[in-house]
């Protein structure tokens, strides 16, 4: 007779997902000369060891930090670039502009990118049937628990100026409760961070709007405002030519407004 | 090979501060931590935090937090652990120590602080 | 805060001996444990990593297993220079805590 399974609202574990964690650790560490001395078995290990044999709802930052540890890395702290349901255009972004990093960049980013897992309490099986959804189920399962983490890292190291790139077709272009917004924000070191500066990518190609002037952009100002950084806004009218002129900047099109 | 050199003995008055460096070599200062570690005389060890000097991450013990400081110098792959407010259960030999795989594997020869009016 | 309790403290053995060494944690570290050896006046030396992973340069008569909340170090053959002083330390969670230590003397 099967065992009763816990069953989530939310897909279960990426199928052959150990695999796919250490094939990604070997690929990043041999592309980046500076993470060769990691031990990938560790990293595994670590990664593994934060959510194996525990209840998927009950895990906590200090259940990561163990990985934490293992995938820290140097990462130009002045060179970071934030997103906000806008991931593609970002990753596309500092695949071409090679001295900017988007937190999935960094190795802990890089292994975990559009993966789910869980676990079960009490037997080490990975579940690959469901895991819990942040809404319908609990806020501190696996996956939440591990981009809080990481994400609240990335945002600590960041100083000078720090760039996030927004969504202007959404209805909420800055959203308090994405992980930027509740999250990285307030994560941000005054003593550190001079300036966020905000790039609005905007969708429709006749859209001509300002919407640095959108209510939840001055909404994101006065947040910023009040942690003593200063904030700055420009909008991206045509990201695909925007990202033309990123890889050729010298073309005579690109000194117009992108 | 890897090398953890640290400076000198001190001593100090109560009240005072002790800034102890620990020179790395042999590896790349800003790819691994560095842990530090205390000793009373006659005592077990007692980790007294870390720091990754590559993203200037630091982490500390919660018993010394406020009275310890560590900072690394990327130009000198040096390491310090600035500990403040001292009082006479502050002497002990403390040592630097480097990171790997959440152990530590190469220390310093370590430093004498004594505490003493 | 994670207690490490080592046992036993100290204990007498000779030279050729079997010595096992234990090290108990108040919860889980899965396998981040390290053991260390220490000797009057010196800087502790790494032994073994990760629970059961001996250190570059260190004797194979050393060996570490366990993992989840009790481990052992195992002397297979203890030799005039292993008398000294061995410490176990979690890496599983801040602050890192170290065992009270084991003294290993010359009977």
């Known amino acids: 007779v099967p065992r009763w399974r816990q069953q989530w609202s939310g897909p279960g574990t990426t199928k052959r997902f150990p695999e796919t964690v250490l094939a990604r650790c070997v690929k990043y560490t041999e592309i980046h000369p500076e993470m060769r001395h990691v031990d990938c078995q560790s990293v595994w290990d670590a990664f593994k060891g934060a959510f194996i044999s525990k209840h998927p709802c009950n895990i906590t930052e200090e259940d990561y930090q163990p990985l934490m540890k293992l995938g820290t890395q140097t990462v130009p702290c002045n060179k970071i670039l934030l997103w906000s349901r806008i991931k593609d255009l970002a990753h596309q972004f500092t695949q071409v502009q090679r001295d900017m990093f988007t937190l999935e960049d960094t190795l802990l980013g890089y292994l975990a990118d559009d993966l789910t897992w869980c676990g079960e309490f009490n037997t080490s099986k990975i579940n690959y049937q469901s895991c819990p959804d942040w809404r319908k189920d609990c806020s501190n399962n696996p996956v939440s628990v591990f981009w809080k983490t990481v994400s609240r890292r990335f945002a600590e190291a960041a100083c000078d100026v720090v760039h996030v790139m927004l969504n202007g077709s959404r209805s909420k272009i800055f959203d308090k409760n994405s992980t930027f917004g509740s999250v990285e924000v307030h994560n941000l070191q005054p003593e550190k961070v001079q300036t966020l500066e905000a790039w609005v990518i905007h969708g429709g190609r006749e859209d001509s709007r300002d919407l640095c002037q959108d209510p939840t952009i001055k909404e994101l100002e006065s947040i910023i405002s009040k942690r003593n950084i200063q904030f700055s806004c420009k909008n991206i009218y045509r990201p695909d030519k925007f990202l033309q002129c990123v890889k050729n900047p010298e073309d005579s099109s690109c000194t117009s407004e992108i | 090979q890897v090398q953890l050199v640290q400076s000198g003995a001190e001593v100090k008055k109560p009240g005072s501060s002790v800034k102890v460096s620990c020179k790395a070599s042999?590896?790349?200062?800003?790819?691994?931590?560095i842990e530090w570690v205390r000793q009373a005389p006659g005592q077990g060890l007692e980790w007294m935090g870390d720091?990754?000097?590559?993203?200037?991450?630091?982490d500390y013990n919660e018993k010394f937090k406020g009275r310890v400081t560590i900072t690394a110098d990327e130009s000198t792959s040096t390491a310090y652990m600035e500990l403040s407010s001292l009082r006479s259960e502050d002497t002990a030999v403390y040592y630097c120590?480097?990171?790997?795989?959440?152990?530590?594997?190469?220390w310093g020869q370590g430093t004498l602080v004594t505490v003493s009016s | 805060d994670i207690q490490m309790t080592q046992s036993p403290s100290s204990l007498s053995a000779s030279v050729g001996d079997r010595v096992t060494i234990t090290c108990s944690a108040s919860?889980?570290?899965?396998?981040?444990l390290g053991w260390y050896q220490q000797k009057p006046g010196k800087a502790p030396k790494l032994l073994i990593y990760?629970?059961?992973n001996l250190h570059t340069g260190v004797p194979s008569r050393f060996s570490g297993s366990g993992s989840g909340t009790d481990f052992t170090l195992t002397i297979s053959s203890l030799q005039p220079e292993d008398f000294a002083t061995y410490y176990c330390?979690?890496?599983?969670?801040?602050?890192?805590?170290f065992g009270q230590g084991t003294k290993v003397e010359i009977k």
């Open positions: 720091i990754f000097p590559g993203g200037g991450y630091t």
């Open positions: 120590a480097r990171g790997r795989d959440l152990a530590m594997d190469y």
């Open positions: 990760k629970a059961s």
């Open positions: 919860q889980n570290i899965n396998v981040w």
């Open positions: 330390q979690q890496g599983q969670s801040y602050p890192y805590t």
């Open positions: 042999g590896y790349t200062f800003t790819n691994h931590w």
